[in-house]
């Protein structure tokens, strides 16, 4: 099974004296949740051509993937520390429902979907830690959540496969704008 | 042009106090966490205090932990450095950077010196 | 306390090659570690020269890059001129601070 970054010794300097908080642990979380995502790329590109589709737009309606926006304080040009983690964390909880959708999709790639879930739920609980201003993160409703779960797995064929394809493109952009965001912080 | 210029240094006593300044331009100084550095006379640099880019969180090299504190003012573009119960190993040129990120790398002003000494 | 460590000195000569290391005493250098490059001739603050592993500072010459390798982050000089005599360091972010190596002198020789 993949290794959690922290469980092997060799892959991070002085493991024990660390807080879970630091910004090299959270870093090399995010670049481990990046490798799943790029393996979990790999599987769905050579399975199908949805990598070279233009017909993106149209299973993209159907999807509320989050998204950083100007508003959230995330980018250089109006960064806001404070609204920026409590947008991080907030975007990797909406993404929680997707990635669970993303379990039964791949055949080759099976522990690397669970591995990309797991440390996603790990990352979530070192960034809450960190941040203060607890109360202005949302959780989204379980029954939303389980509603929008049976609604993508009624998909056709077609459109489980885009799924799938927008889901990791938007969850790698997503994730790669919070790693430059919390190099900040 | 990114400009970091620090001011403050000068020779105080050992348990003395001092504030060094850094005033930045060229660049979106709230976006960016910002570093103080020192460097002993015929020594290497040594890392001594980060401050995030909207000031919420600091970070201390163990050297320094408890005496020193880093503060930034994002309305006047300035980083501080307070530096309280100075020691004779404290003298050193101390220079302010930005952190690299967004696409840039650091920048580092030319250091203000601080001397300790009775 | 990790330490970050450099060759405390070596030599090139000019037009020639030479790779300076930076590695942990406990650990691997990762990506995460951010590693940073920077040359320092007397009485002069220390240039950034790489920044993030293989990023190049802006106006720096493109005979100096960047790279992990093995368990190291490294800085190669190709083609080594002169005036690029001076003493070398590594930064690194290690948890929630930045640790410096020692440097590397290096001679042109």
């Known amino acids: 099974a993949p290794v959690l970054p922290g469980e092997d010794s060799k892959d991070v300097a002085a493991p024990h004296s660390q807080p879970l908080t630091s910004s090299e642990r959270i870093d090399k979380h995010i670049r481990y949740i990046l490798d799943g995502i790029s393996a979990l790329r790999k599987e769905t590109c050579n399975r199908s051509n949805m990598c070279e589709s233009s017909k993106e737009a149209l299973a993209e309606n159907n999807l509320n993937l989050p998204k950083m926006a100007e508003k959230d304080g995330c980018f250089q040009s109006g960064f806001n520390e404070d609204t920026c983690l409590v947008k991080i964390i907030t975007g990797l909880l909406e993404f929680e429902v997707y990635l669970e959708y993303l379990q039964n999709r791949f055949e080759s790639s099976e522990e690397q979907a669970r591995a990309v879930q797991m440390s996603t739920k790990v990352l979530i609980q070192f960034l809450q830690k960190k941040a203060k201003n607890l109360d202005a993160i949302t959780t989204p409703e379980p029954t939303t959540n389980a509603s929008l779960l049976t609604k993508l797995q009624a998909q056709n064929q077609w459109l489980q496969d885009m799924t799938t394809h927008l889901i990791l493109r938007s969850f790698k952009e997503f994730l790669q704008s919070s790693l430059r965001a919390l190099r900040q912080m | 042009e990114v400009q970091l210029l620090e001011s403050g240094g000068g020779l105080v006593q050992p348990g003395g106090s001092l504030r060094l300044s850094c005033a930045a331009s060229?660049?979106?100084?709230?976006?960016?966490?910002m570093s103080w550095v020192r460097q002993a006379p015929g020594k290497g640099p040594e890392w001594v205090s980060r401050?995030?880019?909207?000031?919420?969180?600091?970070y201390y090299g163990d050297s320094v932990k408890g005496r020193f504190t880093i503060s930034r003012d994002n309305s006047k573009n300035t980083l501080y450095l307070q530096m309280n119960s100075l020691r004779a190993e404290d003298t050193a040129v101390y220079y302010c950077?930005?952190?690299?990120?967004w696409g840039s790398g650091d920048y580092w002003g030319q250091g203000t010196l601080v001397t300790v000494s009775s | 306390q990790t330490v970050v460590t450099q060759e405390p000195s070596f030599s090139v000569s000019p037009g020639g090659t030479v790779t300076l290391t930076c590695g942990l005493s406990s650990g691997s250098v990762t990506a995460s570690n951010y590693p940073g490059w920077y040359q320092q001739t007397p009485g002069q603050a220390p240039r950034a020269l790489i920044y993030?592993?293989?990023d190049r500072h802006s106006g720096v010459p493109d005979r100096f890059s960047g790279s992990i390798s093995g368990n190291k982050a490294a800085l190669t000089i190709t083609g080594a001129q002169a005036e690029d005599e001076a003493d070398y360091y590594c930064?690194?972010?290690?948890?929630?601070?930045?640790?410096f190596g020692g440097g590397t002198q290096l001679t042109v020789l």
């Open positions: 993030s592993t293989n």
């Open positions: 950077a930005n952190r690299a990120g």
């Open positions: 401050i995030s880019a909207g000031g919420g969180s600091t």
């Open positions: 060229g660049f979106t100084f709230s976006s960016y966490a």
């Open positions: 930064a690194l972010d290690i948890g929630d601070i930045t640790e």
